[in-house]
Interface confidence: low
């Protein structure tokens, strides 16, 4: 004869209040004959849950049909799980007697548990932009969760960051729990593009962790390169000279040419290009009037990034006697196809002021 | 700031229907759920029932069911209490609570409360 | 249902003192206590949570202890603002049930 196993599989079961529980309990052998019965705890106190027999058990139903002659599944469903449905379930096989039935054999125990999922995780990064090479602080933060074991991790582009502090409130216990991690995140050039990740894993999520994201575009800010270049030929009376920005984000930009370190005010033709790493470059091009008595012109482009300090660069004008003396109709080549080009630019400047103008 | 906010005091007769709110502000209101409490004057405090504002679904305290109807309107963050055929022993204050922490979870303790309707059942 | 009993109804007590209130519950319901102070014509305030968790800005001299079946809150310097009713709650198993209450007077 096949000794009778009691088999509760799960150790421990997780529920949220107001939903319904199945606790599983199969039987190895249908011997001796007897009842299985379902109770809460263990000793004399021990509380009744289900007996098919007798009793009125309203809010529990079997899995199978117990009636069946061959059934060897007594798992059972509670509904409308509350607070004080938690304690240790097991299913106990009795042998039938006369005039009792005596108890002869019980699984291992199911402990039930409440469980709460926690939050979807909200990221928040710093107040302030920061340029490359310095630490920003992300927060992650999850809240209403149970039991207190929970797992985060913090991801930089998928790789996992180590960097980071995290405590889960309140320490002692309590129906549900909070958890705040603090990752700090270097900042790299190239970061516009990059996101921060948390995630969160706890055991009701059952193996699909929750995740919050923040874009390090939010946080970084890459200060631009400026280089000023005169172009080497005149158009008629006019030099072209070219200022150019390079590598910075946000887009928030203010450009102004200064002649001899008077502000000009006239429409300068610019473009605005975006690089694969998300920063920007931003082109302006100004022309200059040149005369035998215009011989010391400073000029001067001043760019203010995104509210920062002004940042400018100058440059003397070279006004060879050869470019005095060149004139707007000479020999059609390069200085024919650089007024073509100007052209384009004056003509196509109006449509990127909006981009000049924007704070 | 989260607030609790509740309908004004209620004088009926015996026999009468009574219908407090409860207005919710400052959270997401079908994130946690609601319990009523009550307090006859110069008493302790009952708790009535819970409430899943998610789900609607309530949990009542076996004194308060069957004149006792509680329900939402989660389009407008607020919960009610309904009190059919009023006695003399339900002149009392009532007060909303709410859970502590996110649904899912069970209720508890209470942190937020409304600052309580008088109502007073007289012939 | 499980009772918390309260069994000191009042307390007399004087400014500066060490006061202890006490409650027991009927059955064992771990730490799942609450406590709770109301003043005349207003709502209970939570003061303390799961026995012994201080709620955020409540004065360090209110205490909670205590599990299973008997749990104490106390005042350790007492003062003239502390003077009102005072609740356990457990939330152990429904239906949730609160302390009739201990109310602090001045000697």
């Known amino acids: 004869e096949e000794e009778l196993q009691m088999i509760q599989p799960e150790k421990l079961l997780l529920v949220t209040v107001g939903k319904t529980a199945t606790l599983h309990c199969t039987v190895t052998s249908l011997l001796p004959v007897g009842p299985v019965l379902w109770f809460r705890g263990v000793g004399p106190g021990r509380e009744l849950i289900y007996n098919q027999k007798e009793g009125h058990f309203p809010r529990v139903t079997t899995v199978s049909d117990l009636t069946k002659r061959n059934n060897m599944d007594f798992s059972i469903r509670i509904s409308s799980i509350t607070p004080a449905d938690v304690g240790t379930y097991y299913c106990v096989k009795f042998r039938k007697g006369s005039p009792e039935n005596v108890e002869f054999k019980s699984g291992p125990g199911t402990e039930m548990a409440l469980g709460a999922k926690p939050s979807a995780p909200v990221v928040l990064g710093p107040a302030a932009r920061t340029t490359p090479e310095h630490t920003v602080s992300f927060t992650c933060e999850s809240h209403g969760f149970s039991p207190r074991d929970i797992t985060l991790k913090w991801f930089k582009n998928g790789n996992e960051l180590s960097d980071f502090q995290t405590n889960v409130d309140p320490t002692g216990q309590s129906v549900a729990y909070s958890i705040r991690s603090t990752a700090r995140v270097v900042l790299d050039p190239w970061d516009v593009r990059s996101q921060v990740i948390c995630e969160v894993a706890h055991v009701t999520l059952q193996g699909d962790p929750l995740r919050g994201t923040a874009n390090l575009s939010e946080a970084i800010r890459v200060p631009p390169t400026l280089e000023v270049t005169q172009q080497p030929m005149r158009v008629g009376n006019q030099v072209n000279v070219t200022c150019q920005v390079r590598k910075f984000y946000p887009q928030s930009l203010q450009l102004t040419w200064s002649e001899n370190g008077n502000v000009c005010q006239r429409e300068t033709a610019s473009t605005l290009t975006e690089n694969k790493d998300g920063t920007y470059n931003w082109t302006s091009w100004f022309l200059v009037n040149i005369s035998d008595q215009r011989d010391d012109v400073v000029l001067t482009c001043q760019v203010k990034h995104d509210g920062q300090l002004a940042v400018s660069k100058r440059l003397a004008l070279e006004v060879t006697v050869h470019q005095k003396d060149q004139s707007s109709d000479a020999t059609p080549g390069p200085a024919s196809s650089l007024t073509a080009l100007l052209l384009i630019a004056v003509l196509l400047g109006p449509i990127y002021v909006p981009w000049k103008q924007k704070t | 700031q989260i607030q609790l906010v509740q309908s004004g005091p209620e004088l009926k007769k015996p026999g009468e229907t009574v219908k407090i709110s409860c207005k919710a502000s400052?959270?997401?209101?079908?994130?946690?759920?609601m319990s009523w409490v009550k307090q006859a004057p110069g008493k302790g405090l009952k708790w009535m029932v819970w409430i899943n504002t998610y789900s609607g679904v309530p949990t009542y305290a076996d004194d308060f069911k069957g004149r006792f109807a509680f329900s939402l309107e989660t389009s407008a963050s607020t919960s009610y209490l309904q009190i059919n055929n009023l006695k003399n022993e339900d002149t009392a204050t009532y007060f909303c609570a709410r859970d502590p922490h996110y649904y899912g979870s069970s209720p508890a303790w209470f942190v937020y409360w409304g600052q309580g309707t008088l109502v007073t059942v007289s012939a | 249902d499980i009772v918390m009993t309260q069994s000191q109804k009042f307390m007399s007590t004087t400014i500066g003192d060490r006061v202890s209130i006490t409650c027991e519950a009927s059955q064992i319901v771990g730490i799942a206590v609450a406590w709770y102070q109301q003043k005349p014509g207003q709502s209970p305030k939570l003061l303390i949570y799961?026995?012994?968790n201080r709620y955020t800005g409540v004065p360090d001299r209110f205490t909670g202890s205590g599990s299973g079946t008997d749990f104490t809150l106390t005042i350790s310097n007492m003062q003239s603002e502390d003077l009102a009713n005072y609740f356990c709650?457990?939330?152990?198993?429904?239906?949730?049930?609160f302390g009739s209450g201990t109310k602090l007077e001045v000697k």
């Open positions: 799961s026995a012994s």
């Open positions: 400052g959270y997401t209101f079908t994130t946690y759920g």
């Open positions: 709650q457990q939330y152990s198993a429904y239906p949730f049930t």
